[in-house]
């Protein structure tokens, strides 16, 4: 069976204070079944970012719908974006468990915050 | 405002077991990295134990395997479950929250604990 | 494990004057460097974070500088509320988080 693959394309992404960052995310197979997560760092102070299971993310939403079947498209739109929001993005797959269990985590995008234009 | 209230502290023996508690307000606790760090009398800080907001566990060689960190996203509250306790676990206990980016932002007033025979 | 050696021990100062806290890491931590204040009796409090980043609401005399595995905390014009222990913590390395066996600012 051919293991899964969590891809982010973009090692680095830069937005202008304001705007909104795309953080792109796909996985190789639906299989196993269980959540993506995105969080922001790794190690013990990794901050949830999305989690579609549970949760109040209003600055964030899904590009697609990752309720859809089939989908496996779960990247993210951060919107007003702020220099508080730089850091390394990861998406992280789970299987589906009590609790869910991590599977795999993607290599990560660092989002830089660029001073909005005068 | 961010509050972390710790609790649980006291005086025990050598071997006995002892769980702390950390009440957290003013973020969404379940989000976000926890830990406890110690402080020996008249000495430094030492990082003991960190659970992240997904509930993956670390800790420092000199407590694993005695020391349990959890938490209860539902109740916005850390626990150090510590046993096999010694003499040398005698320290101000901290409760801290940690940052994305795997420092400590803010801090608990700490609780004592005492292992003494 | 990654080990922080802060210098000097203690630091005597006058009041108005600048104060140099030294920290000294055993491998490179990448800028990844905070430094936290703590007054007797109280908890410690973070100042800065990513070698140069002050934390929220903290004033601009406390600054920090510094790469690879060298980096200063400087206090310029010291106040009364300034005299404390200073520790250094890398957030590099999460295993283990380790801090500095600090450095005890006094007044001269």
């Known amino acids: 069976e051919e293991e899964l693959q969590v891809i982010q394309p973009e090692k680095s992404v830069s937005v202008a204070a304001g705007d909104s960052a795309t953080l792109n995310c796909t996985v190789s197979s639906l299989i196993p079944v269980g959540p993506i997560q995105w969080f922001r760092g790794a190690g013990p102070g990794r901050e949830l970012i999305y989690n579609l299971k549970e949760g109040h993310f209003p600055r964030v939403t899904a590009v697609s719908d990752p309720t859809k079947r089939n989908n496996m498209d779960f990247s993210i739109r951060i919107s007003n974006i702020t220099p508080a929001d730089a850091g390394t993005y990861y998406c992280v797959k789970f299987r589906k468990g009590s609790p869910d269990v991590e599977l795999k985590s993607g290599a990560g995008t660092e989002l830089s915050v660029r001073a909005k234009p005068s | 405002d961010v509050q972390l209230v710790e609790s649980g502290g006291g005086v025990v023996r050598p071997g006995e077991s002892l769980r702390l508690s950390c009440a957290a307000s003013?973020?969404?606790?379940?989000?976000?990295?926890m830990s406890w760090v110690r402080q020996a009398p008249g000495e430094g800080l030492e990082w003991v134990s960190a659970?992240?907001?997904?509930?993956?566990?670390y800790y420092a060689d000199s407590v694993k395997g005695r020391f349990t960190i959890s938490r209860d996203n539902s109740k916005n509250t850390l626990y150090l479950q510590m046993n096999s306790l010694r003499a040398e676990d005698t320290a101000i206990y901290y409760c801290?929250?940690?940052?994305?980016?795997?420092?400590?932002?803010?801090w608990g007033l700490g609780t004592l604990v005492t292992v003494s025979s | 494990e990654i080990v922080l050696a802060q210098s000097p021990d203690t630091l005597s100062v006058s009041p108005g004057e600048r104060a140099t806290l030294t920290c000294r890491a055993s491998?490179?931590?990448?800028?990844?460097l905070a430094w936290y204040q703590q007054k007797p009796g109280q908890a410690p409090r973070l100042l800065i974070h990513a070698t140069s980043s002050r934390a929220d609401g903290i004033p601009a005399r406390f600054s920090g500088s510094g790469s690879g595995t060298e980096f200063t905390l400087t206090i310029t014009g010291l106040q009364s509320e300034d005299f404390a222990v200073y520790y250094c913590?890398?957030?590099?390395?999460?295993?283990?988080?380790?801090f500095g066996g600090g450095t005890k600012v006094e007044i001269k």
């Open positions: 659970s992240s907001g997904s509930g993956s566990t």
């Open positions: 491998q490179d931590v990448a800028g990844k």
């Open positions: 913590q890398q957030h590099y390395d999460w295993s283990p988080l380790t």
């Open positions: 801290a929250k940690v940052t994305w980016n795997n420092f400590f932002d803010y």
């Open positions: 003013g973020f969404t606790f379940r989000n976000y990295g």
